[in-house]
Structure formats: C-alpha cells, structure tokens
Amino acid sequence: LVVTPPGPELVLNVSSTFVLTCSGSAPVVWERMSQEPPQEMAKAQDGTFSSVLTLTNLTGLDTGEYFCTHNDSRGLETDERKRLYIFVPDPTVGFLPNDAEELFIFLTEITEITIPCRVTDPQLVVTLHEKKGDVALPVPYDHQRGFSGIFEDRSYICKTTIGDREVDSDAYYVYRLQVSSINVSVNAVQTVVRQGENITLMCIVIGNEVVNFEWTYPRKESGRLVEPVTDFLLDMPYHIRSILHIPSAELEDSGTYTCNVTESVNDHQDEKAINITVVESGYVRLLGEVGTLQFAELHRSRTLQVVFEAYPPPTVLWFKDNRTLGDSSAGEIALSTRNVSETRYVSELTLVRVKVAEAGHYTMRAFHEDAEVQLSFQLQINVPVRVLELSESHPDSGEQTVRCRGRGMPQPNIIWSACRDLKRCPRELPPTLLGNSSEEESQLETNVTYWEEEQEFEVVSTLRLQHVDRPLSVRCTLRNAVGQDTQEVIVVPHSLPFKV
C-alpha cells in the first residue's frame, strides 16, 4: 500500500481542502472511525487500484486517525493497512468529543491504560488532573492517543490552554473491577412452605463486580415470570445478591430453582440449584418408631430420643402420667428439643439417676396449628435383683427347709443348687440343681408378689429337703434382665451338733 502524502502525521489548516491518495495491487479503501467516508475508487491500466479521499472545509473535528486498507483481503495479508494521523488545529474545538463508553474505563487487573483526551493542535500543552485536584499528574501525554499509565480508581480530567482560555475535558472514570472465577451460593429463607406463604431465594456471588443473573423456576416454565431484585451487600465487598421473591406460593411452585450467573469479562459461569417444596398444609412426621415399652435401670441415667420432621416449627411438650414435665431444678429431668435441620428436630428426655417413682406413662406431644403427634410409651424401671434373706429351719416334721427371699424388676427367676462335697465344690465339681419335680429328696414352693408402690417383684421360694445325711452347701441364685445375686447356706444333718 502506498499513501500520499506519506505522513504518518499531518498538520492541516482549518477550512482548507486536502486530498489523500492510497494505491495498491488490489482494491483499496479509506476508513475513518470504522466507517468508509465518500471517496473515489479507480483502477489504472497497469492494474493498480487507487482510492482518493478529498477532505473539504476542514475543522478541528476532522482531527484523528485515517486508515487505508485493502477492500477485499482474501488471499492478502489481513493486517496490511496504513495509518495516517491528521491534526487540524482549531481554536473553537477544545478536546475532541468522546463516545460515552470512552469516559468509563474498566480494568480487571493492574495494567496500563489510556485516558483518551485529545486536542486538535499538537503544539498545545495538555495536563492531567484528578477531578477535584489542581496538581498536574506526572503521566506522559501522546497527542494522538492521550495519557497512558497505571491509574487508581478515581475520576480524572485533562486541561489545556487555547489562547488565553483554559479548557477542561469531560471527566474520565477509572474502575478497577474485581473479577475472579465465579462462586455462586443459593439459599432460601425456607425450603418448605405452605401454600399461600412466600418463597424467597437468594443467589449470592462473591469476588465479582459485574455479573448477570438468570433464574429458572417452575413458574417460569408456565410463562409466569417473576422479576428478581439485585443488590450489593455494602458491608461485604464484592458480594452481589439476586433475590427471587414469589408471594403466595402455590403447590405448582414446588420444584427446582436454579440461579445461573455469568461474568462477561472472562466469560465465566456457574449455577446452583435448590429444591423448594410447597405443602398443602403443615405436617408432623416421625422418623423411626419408639417402642411402646421402654426400660431404664435404677440409679442410672437414661435418655429417650424422638426424631421427627415438622413444618411449621412445632411446640414440643413432654408429659408423665398426663402431667406436664419441665426441666427440674434438682437436675433429675432434662428436656431439650434441637432443630438439627430446617424441618428436622430431635427431642430428648433425660432422666438423671433414675428413681423408681419415675416409672410410668410418658407422652411427647409435638404440635402446631395444622397437625400434631402424640408419642406414648410406658417406662419400666429395671431394678437389679437382691437376695434379701436366705435362712434354714428344722420343722418338727423332720425335714429341713431353706427359705430364699429376693426382689427385682423385671421378675427374677430363682435357681436352687446344692453341693455335697464342701471341699471340692463349687470350684471342681459343679453344684447340683435342686427343685426338679423328679427328685424326691427335695421339694420347691415359690410365690411371686408385685409391689405396686415400689414397682418391683418379690420372690419367696422355700426348698424342702427330705433327709440330709451330711453337710450340704445350698445356694439360692436370683437372676433377671439386669443382674443376678447369690447367697449360700450350709445345711447340716439333725444329728450334728453344730451349724456353720
């Protein structure tokens, strides 16, 4: 490409006319501000193409870049073009006008930028200032481009003097944008709502300043659009939030709500979804069954736990034998209901060092205005067995009797056993079980009584021994679900003068 005059910089007089010519081996065209001004194109006999641009009645606004480029770049070097910069000093034009977007300069990293304030006269002295400051900033100036350097997030103006008149440019605003990989979080005020209540969702992006939110939701699919609201969380820098609010939810609003966020600077994107359930009315549901008979061991602590789901949040009460329970000041009973997730609860009744009196009928009631559950169970206090008495007697009938009395809850079983060889028993020889009906030498009689007040069973068992011819170790063992207890007595024949 050949341009005449060759430039690269020309200074022309205002109101004059000037002709620019460009020629090349293929069709050529002049461009000014990305447009093709009126020009004359021709093809010479030698096959050379040319274009003539005539600039008439020049003004300062004709100041700027002019390019000559190939009209059809097929098969040619696409980047071949010639640049010419023309100044038309014009005292009536201060700074050349900018498009609105040129006044706002956005940065995503610390980098050199240009504040594009340009004048029509290359001889003018131009200075750069902060908008509210008089001090000229030490930034190099190029009359064809403007001030280039690294700038802070501020507002700037350029100044020059034309004759005796000081001229200010428009203000330029530099913004350093925070741009990072997008991290979206979506949450809802409630993920479960009753019909008629509101659905409110929030989509928050951290680390970016300019993003675009797009929501998809069940209502949108049926053509009913909801306008989200976007705001900036002032107390948290670079937090942008989009709020989707659906008043008076319907059952059809149940489903997946997705927030899609795009950031156009680096073309990043992320999306998160959340499920919303709209229920016709509130509910209570149990997660797991509690047996209708529960056990606790005397003097031990016992926690009874109920896990349930409810919406709206319920009131939880515990009762014993139809009387309301509360945390006891003595620390014998502790009640707690924890909200372990939005709609899930764990309610616990803890009995500290269980007493017999704490046996009874317990009910947990969880309720709200729509629904309830009453969970009931009987609490049985298990008491380890104790042998309270083991005694031997010699009735006149000649037989010998051994009486064993013990208590416990649940009902104890009684086991009688005897050992005839005192030296070797019970270590070497196992004791013989007594009381089997087949054995004629012993008879057994057992009575069981339930003591309502103490809530435990008493077992009284009498062993009748028909003839004892040598010392005999008789053992009474009581056993129930929570333990066993044993006592032993030596029974001697009538004829022997001593008893152990």
């Epitope: 229920v279 549901r285 149990l286 069954e289 169970f377």
Partner: nanobody, 124 residues
Framework: EVQLVESGGGLVEAGGSLRLSCTAS????????MGWFRQAPGKEREFAAA????????GYKESVKGRFTISRDNAKNTVYLQMNSLKPEDTAVYYC?????????????????WGQGTQVTVSS
C-alpha cells in the same frame, strides 16, 4: 400392593357417633403408618388423624381433637376412627391411607396407598 377398604360411613345427626373401619390386604399391615383424611364438598383433602405402626403415636387435626379417636388392631389388619360429638362441618368423604415412608405422618403426600373413601354426612 396394599388395598384399603373403608366402611362405617353414613348419615348421622349432629352430636351422634360413627365408627369408621379400614381393612388392609396385600401387605404386612404392621409396617405401615395409617391415616384418615377427609374431603368436604368443594374443599381440598385434609388430614384428620394418624397412627404410627405400633400404635404408640397418634395425632389429630385440632378441630377434631377430643372428639375423634384413632386406633389400630394389627392382628386384624384394621385401623379405626371413632367419631363422637359429630358436627355438620365434619361432613365429608373420609379416606383411609397407608404410608410405607414414615412411621407416622400427617402429610398427605407421604401416603402411598389410598382407599376409595366412605361418605359421612352429619345433619343439623
């Protein structure tokens, strides 16, 4: 698959009583939470009462509490709703429902199996 058949509905004067029964077949009854729901003319179906698998947990809609009693007999595969002091606003079709999902629930959507319903009409 569980089939549920309700019975015991009918016409009764205000203040009277009815006992609804629901018999299940085709499944292990004791593994289902059972519920009674009702639907009055022109209204949505609503929870009335529910009972857990072992009968240890029960619950009622506030407006029927103290008047209705739910119970079950796992040996007979039957759940009952004893309705006393009936009011005209209790008029509805009463549906029996079974839930495998939870041991007890008042939420209609938790119930997998439904009966055809039995009409209860309370005249004033």
């Amino acid at each position: 698959e569980v089939q549920l058949v309700e019975s015991g509905g009918g016409l009764v004067e205000a203040g009277g009583s009815l006992r609804l029964s629901c018999t299940a077949s085709g499944g292990t009854f004791s593994t289902y939470a059972m519920g009674w729901f009702r639907q009055a003319p022109g209204k949505e179906r609503e929870f009335a009462a529910a009972i857990s698998r072992n009968g240890g947990s029960k619950g009622y809609k506030e407006s029927v509490k103290g008047r209705f009693t739910i119970s079950r007999d796992n040996a007979k595969n039957t759940v009952y709703l004893q309705m006393n002091s009936l009011k005209p606003e209790d008029t509805a079709v009463y549906y029996c429902a079974a839930s495998r999902t939870y041991t007890y629930s008042t939420a209609m959507k938790d119930y997998n199996y439904w009966g055809q319903g039995t009409q209860v009409t309370v005249s004033s």
